[in-house]
């Protein structure tokens, strides 16, 4: 079989900024890692920034995570909570282009969803979203 | 339809699962009008960190 990457990049989307977190193979040490749905491919999810008033633009820094070269799991050095969210969009049709971040359909839908979440979770604690995956309903 | 799966990140202690879900559900009507996205079947769960990609995914099929 042909090879794709063993690591991938996800984008944390937030107001006016994108904090990029790279997933790497377990043997590597990385200061900040978010597991990706695309863990065997080099795909980077396109980041999206919403336009906000300068006064309300919130530049977030993501607390570092530490990991070791051992098989043990990395530990949080400062606190970030992650939530897995799943939902159906009943008025859209899945097609194969939603498996590829370089397609227009994927990018448009990702952009709308990113904007939507920035609207929903305006409070200061929101760091962003990552690992968007689309599948047929 | 399209199923969307994603991970949300918050500073620890600023929100819980229930509030994540509640706020999202409250926004569904506006999502339909603003983005033309008709949202249903919302499911939210904690992702224990660190987590494996596999366990992260298989919880939700």
């Amino acid at each position: 079989a042909s090879g794709s990457a063993s690591g991938s990049a996800s984008t944390l989307v937030h107001n006016g900024t994108s904090a990029r977190a790279t997933t790497t193979p377990a043997s590597k040490s990385t200061p900040f890692s978010i597991p990706s749905h695309h863990s065997d491919t080099p795909t980077t999810l396109a980041s999206h920034s919403t336009k906000t008033d300068a006064s309300s633009t919130h530049h977030s820094s993501v607390p570092p995570l530490t990991s070791s070269n051992h098989s043990t799991s990395p530990q949080l050095s400062t606190g970030v909570s992650f939530f897995f969210l799943s939902f159906h969009i009943s008025n859209l049709q899945f097609n194969s282009s939603l498996e590829d971040p370089s397609t227009d359909y994927y990018q448009e839908l990702q952009r709308d969803i990113s904007e939507m979440f920035l609207q929903i979770y305006k409070q200061g604690g929101f760091l962003g979203l990552s690992n968007i995956k689309f599948r047929p309903g | 339809s399209v199923v969307v799966q994603l991970t949300l990140a918050f500073r620890e202690g600023t929100i819980n699962v229930h509030d994540v879900e509640t706020q999202f559900n409250q926004y569904k009507t506006e999502a339909a009008s603003r983005y033309n996205l008709t949202i249903s079947d919302v499911s939210v769960s904690d992702v224990p960190f660190p987590f494996s990609a596999q366990s992260h995914h298989h919880h939700h099929h």
Epitope: S4, D40, T41, S96, T103, P136 | Q54, H57
Partner: antibody
């Protein structure tokens, strides 16, 4: 390492059907798409269709609609392609290619189908 | 259907040469183009995805670029293992289509 292992070569008679498999391994997720592509002897590549593993979602090239059926078995991480009403021009190597965060990321080794009376 | 016109259909080159293969798309496909490598008896391998992104494990001598509707695969310094057939593939719209292929042979 991600691998796509396809079933062995087939020799079939004109008018018959053939069903081939594409088993994926080395990947943690059960949700992804499989594209099917064929290559006739000495020719280029031709897209047949797509199935999202574990669902009944399919897309077909109009040229093959009605003769091709794509199915999958999530528990076996396997996709299947059945081609019916075979004719000599269907003699080809049939490839599966799976998505891995983007389309056509990994390819199987191919299944040679020979249509001969 | 979107047509991909790939040129040349074959070329002879020597180790160390710079090789350029072009695909022209009949309609706008954005960046939704892959480059594939096929060697006899081996699985097809994707080299480039999304026009210019290099797959992991693919040597950096391979690169992809775009100018309007023309998409180019460049091998900066041809190596013995690069003698193969190369295909472009568009996935902007179904049915997905391939270029006719370019066979790179030893001069």
């Amino acid at each position: 390492e991600v691998q796509l292992v396809q079933s062995g070569a087939e020799v079939v008679k004109p008018g018959a059907s053939v069903k081939m498999s594409c088993k994926t391994s080395g990947y943690t997720f059960t949700s992804y798409g499989i594209n099917w592509v064929r290559q006739r002897p000495g020719q280029g590549l031709e897209w047949i269709g797509y199935i999202y593993l574990g669902s009944d979602y399919t897309e077909y090239n109009e040229k093959f609609k009605g003769r091709v059926t794509l199915t999958s078995d999530t528990s076996a991480s396997t996709a299947y392609m059945e081609l019916s009403s075979l004719r000599s021009e269907d003699t080809a190597v049939y490839y599966c290619a799976r998505s891995a965060g983007s389309l056509f990321g990994y390819w199987g080794q191919g299944t040679l189908v020979t249509v001969s009376s | 259907d979107i047509q991909l016109t790939q040129s040349p259909s074959s070329l002879s080159a020597s180790v160390g040469d710079r090789v350029t293969i072009t695909c022209r798309a009949s309609q706008d496909i954005g960046i939704t183009l892959n480059w594939l490598q096929q060697k006899p008896g081996k699985a097809i391998k994707r080299l480039i995805y999304a026009t210019s992104s290099l797959d992991s494990g693919v040597p950096s001598r391979f690169s992809g670029s775009r100018s309007g509707s023309d998409y180019t695969l460049t091998i900066s310094s041809l190596q013995p293992e690069d003698f193969a057939t190369y295909y472009c593939l568009q996935y902007a719209s179904s049915p997905y289509t391939f270029g006719g292929g370019t066979k790179v042979e030893i001069k």
